[in-house]
């Protein structure tokens, strides 16, 4: 070999200078007598080489690289040979950092694998091969005095954890543990841990289970869950405290924590939850009161809380069939009494015959908000309840009585906007307990079954805003009935539109007779349309050839009109405007010409 490189150090701190020399032997006869030595770092030629001929005839070039900023590179010593660069020798240069102090050293004792698992953070990248060794010794006291050394634990490449097997451990006795990091640029050691393996024991969590319902045990209350846990048996004799966490399966709620619980509670009633809600639950435990590590969270248990019986007030209203007064249509509306009033599965209407204690006859069971049933002849009252799997609401009595109370007066209605109507009245004397307001389409589309109704609990109210099922351009019938202690007053009704439509078109004008200075016109009125308010008046407009306009207002019952004071032999444009409270519409234009002075009248 013709050339040889030697370097001040093959491994340096990143950014440090490095000096290299390349010596070319004299016996390389195929070379120039005065060859020029070139330096290359990686693929780049490096200037600054100082070349000299030594006394033994060899050529030497020395180069100093001021900053080695590559973590790994090849430094080559070359000669120009023909058109190419001939490499005589090359060395690998490495640059990096000495190892930082390993930090966050922590250990866990796993009782199942019978080993102490220690892990650490190695610190920033050194860019150099760095070895880590977990070192430890047994100690009688608090690790100030070193006892027997324990065999070094060397992690697999790239791992930052290591297991010390049971045969090297002494339980209930302290051990000194630290990590040593080493590379070509230096050695560092983590702070020493002093621990008893049992004080870092990490247990397995208990298994959560639902409690098997026993016949004598009371079922859980609404919003409660009964659960139990099976402790992890290998840790059974270790005193522990546990904590439970739960969250609803649906929604974005975060975990709620319950604890501390003793491991041996074994069974537990968790309350204060939402009724009829599916929950996810987990448990974990820690050695306590002695030190330890929290176990992982147990696998999830999914349970549903029991629901609560409906807590609602049922507002009721009823109607008798005109042809068969014993057939009653009962309507109701649930009004929640609490924020969480319970799910309603259905409704039952029932009747208890007098003198038959305990005998209850169901009249209907439905999920709807109304039902029609035949009222037994002796029945004056029925009971309505809402129910679900947890029970029923408080029964609402419905008394079927004659209308004996006073009527309200001055019932009136007015539109608020296209989707609401205000109905007002003057309350009767004495004040009622409340009112039932019903509304639905008026004639010709009127239907008893399609009425909407509302209960106004305030007997002193003098009006109600109808906002449900109100559409513009429809005629509504509104019925208001006052309610008294054991009876009701007669119902009153009124008709109203929330918004009326302008006439869709005005009648067509027809010429009946014409003269020199007059013209008789007629038209056929449009038939009334549902949702369109009645006509209030017509206005007839006529314009002469000189663009002079004239008009006359006619009442809504008009069927014709005579234009007087026209010019003979003149052209006129005429149209009719039909108007209602909701707007007006023009007819098409009729054009006519009056007769010449010498012409005879046309009839």
């Amino acid at each position: 070999e013709c050339g040889h490189i030697s370097v001040s150090a093959p491994i340096v701190h990143l950014g440090d200078p490095i000096t290299a020399s390349c010596i070319i032997k004299q016996n390389c006869s195929h070379l120039d007598p005065e060859p020029q030595i070139l330096w290359r770092l990686g693929a780049e030629l490096q200037p600054g080489g100082r070349q000299q001929r030594l006394s033994d005839g060899t050529q030497e070039s020395i180069i100093t690289l001021p900053h080695l900023n590559h973590t790994q590179a090849f430094l080559s010593c070359c000669l120009n040979w023909g058109n190419s660069l001939q490499i005589l020798d090359q060395v690998e240069l490495r640059a990096g950092y000495p190892p930082a102090i390993p930090h966050n050293l922590s250990c866990l004792m796993n009782l199942t694998t019978s080993s102490l698992i220690c892990q650490w953070e190695p610190g920033p990248e050194t860019h150099l091969p760095t070895s880590f060794t977990l070192k430890s010794f047994k100690s009688r006291g608090n690790c100030q005095t070193q006892g027997d050394s324990i065999l070094d634990c060397v992690p697999k490449d790239g791992q930052s954890h290591c297991c010390i097997p049971r045969k090297h451990l002494l339980l209930y006795q302290n051990m000194g543990i630290w990590v040593q990091a080493e590379n070509a640029l230096g050695t560092s050691m983590s702070p020493q841990l002093c621990l008893d393996p049992m004080d870092v024991v990490k247990l397995e969590p208990p298994m959560l289970r639902t409690m098997d319902p026993s016949p004598e045990a009371a079922p859980p209350q609404a919003g409660c869950l009964q659960l139990c846990w099976e402790p992890w048996q290998p840790g059974l004799h270790i005193n522990q405290k546990c904590e439970l966490r739960h969250k609803p399966q649906r929604g974005e709620a975060s975990w709620a924590l319950v604890g501390p619980l003793p491991l041996e509670a074994l069974q537990y009633e968790l309350c204060g939850l939402l009724p009829a809600t599916a929950y996810t639950l987990q448990i974990r435990c820690i050695r306590w009161p002695l030190p330890g590590h929290w176990s992982d969270w147990s696998p999830s248990l999914e349970l549903r809380t029991t629901e609560r019986a409906p807590t609602v007030r049922l507002d009721t209203w009823w109607r008798q069939r005109q042809l068969d007064p014993r057939t009653v249509q009962l309507f109701w509306k649930p009004v929640p009494l609490e924020e969480d009033s319970g799910r309603i599965q259905g409704y039952v209407v029932s009747w208890r015959p007098s003198g038959q204690a305990g005998a209850i006859l169901p009249l209907c069971n439905t999920t709807e908000l109304s039902c029609t049933f035949h009222l037994p002849s002796e029945a004056q009252e029925v009971a309505l309840v809402a129910y679900n799997s947890a029970g029923t609401s408080r029964p609402t009595p419905v008394v079927f009585s004659e209308s004996r109370g006073p009527a309200l007066t001055r019932l009136h209605a007015m539109a608020r906007d296209p989707h609401s109507l205000w109905v007002g009245w003057e309350p009767p004397n004495p004040w009622p307990q409340g009112y039932v307001i019903e509304w639905g389409l008026g004639p010709p589309s009127a239907s008893n079954s399609n009425k909407t109704w509302r209960m106004e609990q305030n007997g002193r109210a003098t009006g109600f805003l109808l906002k449900e099922n109100i559409r513009p351009f429809q005629l509504y019938e509104i019925i208001v009935t006052p309610l008294y202690q054991d009876t009701m007053g007669p119902s009153q009704h009124v008709y109203a539109y929330s918004q009326e439509m302008a006439p869709s078109h005005a009648p067509e004008l027809h010429l009946k007779h014409i003269g020199k200075t007059w013209a008789q016109l007629e038209w056929v009125p449009e038939p009334p349309e549902l949702g369109k308010s009645p006509l209030t008046h017509y206005t007839i407009f006529w314009t002469n050839a000189q663009n002079q306009s004239f008009s006359a207002i006619l009442n809504a019952s008009s069927r014709g009109f005579v234009l007087h004071g026209l010019e003979p032999a003149s052209l006129y444009h005429i149209h009719l405007m039909a108007a209602s409270q909701a707007g007006a519409t023009n007819s098409t234009v009729l054009t006519l010409m009056t007769l010449t002075p010498e012409g005879s009248e046309l009839h």
Epitope: L111, S114, R166, K167, P231, P234, L236, H237, E264, A265
Partner: antibody, heavy 118, light 107 residues
Framework: EVQLLESGGGLVQPGGSLRLSCAAS????????MGWVRQAPGKGLEWVSS????????PYADSVKGRFTISRDNSKNTLYLQMNSLRAEDTAVYYC???????????WGQGTLVTVSS | DIQMTQSPSSLSASVGDRVTITCRAS??????LNWYQQKPGKAPKLLIY???NLQNGVPSRFSGSGSGTDFTLTISSLQPEDFATYYC?????????FGGGTKVEIK
């Protein structure tokens, strides 16, 4: 120094009852599981029952389940074994023992002899 | 249930001998194996817990090894006071079981 002192043994007829007590001292009784182990004459050791530190967990050997009841009074540092429906095969020396965290019997009483015979 | 089988059931040895007693579990018990010594008319005494941990006050000639199903108690140099019956016990799962015992007698 851990001391466990059993009492309550004696002669009892088959079907009869007996209550063993174990007075503990020298350690914090309420922090440890305790247990009863018996040894029939000339035989090996047989686990009878254990009780958790607060008394909430009480496993039993199948041979005594439903007849024996283990209990403790942490305020009196005392362990009990109520034995009902005694049989001849229950004849043994009954040892009270303190358990360690890994289920080892760290300390033992001197034992009390229970003889079931007609 | 985990059954414990101890062997031999008895052995004769001289002072100074190395004695080995084995205990086999019917299924894996990790390191949850304890050894006891009992002398006639006395209560048992804990020697080794968790397979290899020497109980305080127990001479270092006693040692334990093994894990899973096979365990060994070794007395490196038998002393006159070591003639007794030795029991193993598993403590990983309920119910707890003891081995049948090994009686160490003077040869």
């Amino acid at each position: 120094e851990v001391q466990l002192l059993e009492s309550g043994g004696g002669l009892v007829q088959p079907g009869g009852s007996l209550r063993l007590s174990c007075a503990a001292s020298g350690f914090t009784f309420s922090l440890y599981w305790m247990g009863w182990v018996r040894q029939a004459p000339g035989k090996g050791l047989e686990w009878v029952s254990s009780i958790s530190s607060s008394g909430g967990v009480t496993p039993y050997a199948d041979s005594v389940k439903g007849r024996f009841t283990i209990s403790r009074d942490n305020s009196k540092n005392t362990l009990y074994l109520q034995m009902n429906s005694l049989r001849a095969e229950d004849t043994a020396v009954y040892y009270c023992a303190k358990l360690g965290e890994l289920g080892q019997y760290m300390g033992w009483g001197q034992g009390t002899l229970v003889t079931v015979s007609s | 249930d985990i059954q414990m089988t101890q062997s031999p059931s008895s052995l004769s040895a001289s002072v100074g001998d190395r004695v080995t007693i084995t205990c086999r579990a019917s299924q894996g018990i990790s390191s949850y194996l304890n050894w006891y010594q009992q002398k006639p008319g006395k209560a048992p005494k804990l020697l080794i817990y968790y397979a290899s941990n020497l109980q305080n006050g127990v001479p270092s000639r006693f040692s334990g090894s093994g894990s899973g199903t096979d365990f060994t108690l070794t007395i490196s140099s038998l002393q006159p006071e070591d003639f007794a019956t030795y029991y193993c016990q598993q403590s990983m799962w309920m119910p707890i079981f003891f081995g049948g015992g090994t009686k160490v007698e003077i040869k």
